[in-house]
Structure formats: C-alpha cells, structure tokens
C-alpha cells in the first residue's frame, strides 16, 4: 500500500500575529513528507506546501482573502517514494488517500494575535503631548493595497497608553480607538510612554504585549513651546 510506514501529523497548531499565519505540526518527518490543504467551511480544499520536509506551512496568502471566514487545514503524510512523481501522486500509487490530521478551526479576525505595538512619535506642545502609535501594515489586501491594522479592525481596535513621570512610579492611563493620544502633562517634567493594543469584542487573544517604553528626551520626541 502507498501509505505504509507513514506517521500521521499531530499537534497541529495555528501561529498567527497581525494575520501572518503559519500552521505548525509534529513530528519531524522520517521517510515521509507532508502536503497541507486548507479550506473555508463551505469551500474547496486547496493544496499548499507540497511534499515538504518542513513541519510548518505559511498559509497567510489564503487566510488574508477573507479574514472573517473560518478556516480548516489538514496535513497529509505522504511516503517519501510517492513524493517524487509529481503532485498527482498525493493519493498514493493505488489512489488511496494518505493519512492526514485536521487542524483546529481558525478564524483570523477573532484569533490572530496582536503584535507588539510601536510608539511612532510623541510631540509636546506646552502642557499637551500627542503620542502616535505606528499603524502597522498587515498582509491583508483590498484593491491591491495592503491594509493597516486599523483598516482591518476599525473601532474594534483600542490602544491603551500607560504614561508616567520619569521621576516617579505612579502611572496614568488613557485610551483611544484611533492611533493618537492627546494627554495633559506637567510643564518641565519628562514622561515615559508604553502602549498596548486591545480588541474589546474578543474573549481570547484580546491584548498585545506592551510596546517598548519610550521616554521624553529621547530621539522620537519633539518639543515646542
């Protein structure tokens, strides 16, 4: 049989950040290779990563077609000797289907992790500081242009700002559903800033890690009277 001595994949796991999406699995192949298929709940299977010896497959190109769809992937274990005859031999020399394992379902819009945000700039004018969060580009496209995280999530995405005087430990917080904060500060004081992204409507993967801390007096800032 064409499926002898193949080991079914296991521990299929989606790894996704800002819609960059990779399916990972085990085990490392011995005398076999893998082919991955992906589909929406109602769609046809599409094959990716043909006859690979990797234990991961980048499925970003497929899931960004509609990030609100729910996707299912499956990983086929194909005997090494069958993988050298071209794509038509996926189902073995006698036409039987090789063993495969299904992934968990994955809905990118609800499940992709939020990447660590970056403070793009801050500008002080008198006792006000405008803090701007970089609007990271994703691999999601519309009309042939890549969308930013804000384009994709709209007001579903909130940024929380933590800020504090360099000279004290007491923190304050503010939030925005744009990418800009305008906060009051004490004149003559230096402040430090960190931001976190949040998707309020989610129940899991709701928050990003905190951005790197940026402090006034460093190069990202600008001061005007």
């Amino acid at each position: 049989s064409g499926t002898t001595n193949t080991v079914a994949a296991y521990n299929l796991t989606w790894k996704s950040t800002n819609f960059k999406t990779i399916l990972e699995w085990e085990p490392k192949p011995v005398n076999q290779v893998y082919t991955v298929q992906i589909s929406t709940k109602s769609g046809d299977w599409k094959s990716k990563c043909f006859y690979t010896t990797d234990t991961e497959c980048d499925l970003t190109d497929e899931i960004v077609k509609d990030v609100k769809q729910t996707y299912l992937a499956r990983v086929f274990s194909v005997p090494w000797r069958n993988s050298t005859h071209g794509k038509e031999t996926l189902f073995g020399t006698h036409g039987e289907e090789p063993p495969y394992e299904n992934s968990p379902e994955f809905t990118p819009y609800l499940e992709t992790n939020l990447g660590q945000p970056t403070i793009q700039s801050f500008e002080q004018v008198g006792t006000k500081v405008n803090v701007t969060v970089e609007d990271e580009r994703t691999l999601v496209r519309r009309n042939n242009t890549f969308l930013s995280l804000r384009d994709v999530f709209g007001k579903d995405l909130i940024y929380t700002l933590y800020y504090w005087k360099s000279s004290s430990s007491g923190k304050k917080t503010a939030k925005t559903n744009t990418n800009e904060f305008l906060i009051d500060v004490d004149k003559g004081e230096n402040y430090c800033f960190s931001v976190q992204a949040v998707i309020p409507s989610r129940t899991v993967n709701r928050k990003s890690t905190d951005s790197p801390v940026e402090c006034m007096g460093q190069e990202k800032g600008e001061f005007r009277e």
Epitope: K175, I183, D210
Partner: antibody, heavy 117, light 107 residues
Framework: QVQLVESGGGVVQPGRSLRLSCKAS????????MHWVRQAPGKGLEWIGL????????IYDPKFQGRFTISADNSKNTLFLQMDSLRPEDTAVYYC??????????WGQGTPVTVSS | DIQMTQSPSSLSASVGDRVTITCKAS??????LNWYQQKPGKAPKLLIY???SLADGVPSRFSGSGSGTDYTFTISSLQPEDIATYYC?????????FGQGTKLEIT
C-alpha cells in the same frame, strides 16, 4: 458563566490593614483589565484603581496611591486589594469589576468593610 | 483630573414620562462614557457604553447621546422597574471618574 465573587470584608479598627479578594470564574483575568470600585453608605461610586494582570501594570486614583495596593494571582484567577492605614472614611462596599476596554461588563456582588474602633 | 458633573442629583417623574439626565465633563472625553443603573444593595448594571451604544439585553427605552464634554441619558417612557440611581462614568483617562449619581423616584 462569568462570575466575580469578593470576600475578605468585615469590621476593622482604624490604622489596621485588610486584604480583599475577588475570585473570578468563567474567564481568565489576565485577558482583561480588572478594577476596584467602592461605595460609602448612601454615597456614590468611587473608582480606586485597575490592574492588567498579564503584566502587573497598576493605575490608581491618586487619593489611594500608596495606601491601597492592587495585585493579582493569575494561577488562582484572583484579584486582590490590600488596604493599609484604614480610616473611618474607608467604610464602604468594595466591588471588583471586569473591563473589556469599552465598559465594565461584570461586577462582583460587593464586600462590606467597616472601619470603626 | 477629569471632573464629571451629573445633574440633577434627584428627580421625580411619573410612569410613562420622558426622563433626561446629563453629565458634563471638565474636558473632552471622546465618548468614553458609560451609564450605569444601580438598585439598592446591588452592583451597578451597564446600560449604555461609548456614549450612545445600548448594552446587550437592555430595553430600547434607554438611550444615550453626546460627544466632547456634554452627554445625555434618556428614558423615553419611564417604567416602575426603572426606579434606581443612575451614574455616568468616564473611562477615557485615569483616574476614571463617576458622576455624583441621580436618584430617580416615581411620583
């Protein structure tokens, strides 16, 4: 289902300390911001502070900074409010609440604290 | 810090009346304003979030409006079960602040 249950309230003498707990079930506290709010008898609601249990960030109303400390034990899915140097005016019902970033969507039933000699 | 001035502090109305409560912020709070209902001995219950959005399961007679510094909460037709104290909360920046509350009674 989501539930928050406060405990640890009671009668305490002025100058003493008290630690309140808020046990969460039906969700992981590290996925949310968590708050403490209090209400003195016959008075309005007063925000004490918040914690992001995932990274330990805490924010307080300045009037409570230094005397009250919010912490969390993610392994026990529990929020804490450590209150030191208690005063009679700290007599109130203390609530914990979950914050989804647009609103506080779940509140505990409250635990009463009386500061009296 | 942002101050929230809520008015009136109490009001009396009849069943079926239209009831309006206002909250004025000391600075722009960018619609980060919620309205809560609290009945004696109970925790507050969310009615309106982001100034105008009705919370799940809340009757449509409750509504909110406003932006910038001025916000309004309306009950279009007062029902007996609406007897409670109502609070606004700004959460745009810390310290978060509640209005003083409006105690609603039925005449």
């Amino acid at each position: 289902q989501v539930q928050l249950v406060e405990s640890g309230g009671g009668v305490v003498q002025p100058g003493r300390s008290l630690r309140l707990s808020c046990k969460a079930s039906g969700f992981n506290i590290k996925d949310y911001y968590m708050h403490w709010v209090r209400q003195a008898p016959g008075k309005g609601l007063e925000w004490i502070g918040l914690i992001d249990p995932e990274n330990g960030n805490t924010i307080y109303d300045p009037k409570f900074q230094g005397r009250f400390t919010i912490s969390a034990d993610n392994s026990k899915n529990t929020l804490f409010l450590q209150m030191d140097s208690l005063r009679p005016e700290d007599t109130a019902v203390y609530y914990c609440a979950r914050d989804n970033s647009y609103y506080f969507d779940y509140w505990g039933q409250g635990t009463p604290v009386t500061v009296s000699s | 810090d942002i101050q929230m001035t809520q008015s009136p502090s109490s009001l009396s109305a009849s069943v079926g009346d239209r009831v309006t409560i206002t909250c004025k912020a000391s600075q722009d709070i960018r619609k980060y304003l919620n309205w809560y209902q609290q009945k004696p001995g109970k925790a507050p219950k969310l009615l309106i979030y982001y100034a105008t959005s009705l919370a799940d399961g809340v009757p449509s007679r409750f509504s909110g409006s406003g932006s910038g510094t001025d916000y309004t909460f309306t009950i279009s037709s007062l029902q007996p079960e609406d007897i409670a104290t109502y609070y606004c909360l700004q959460h745009g920046e810390s310290p978060y602040t509640f209005g003083q509350g409006t105690k609603l009674e039925i005449t």
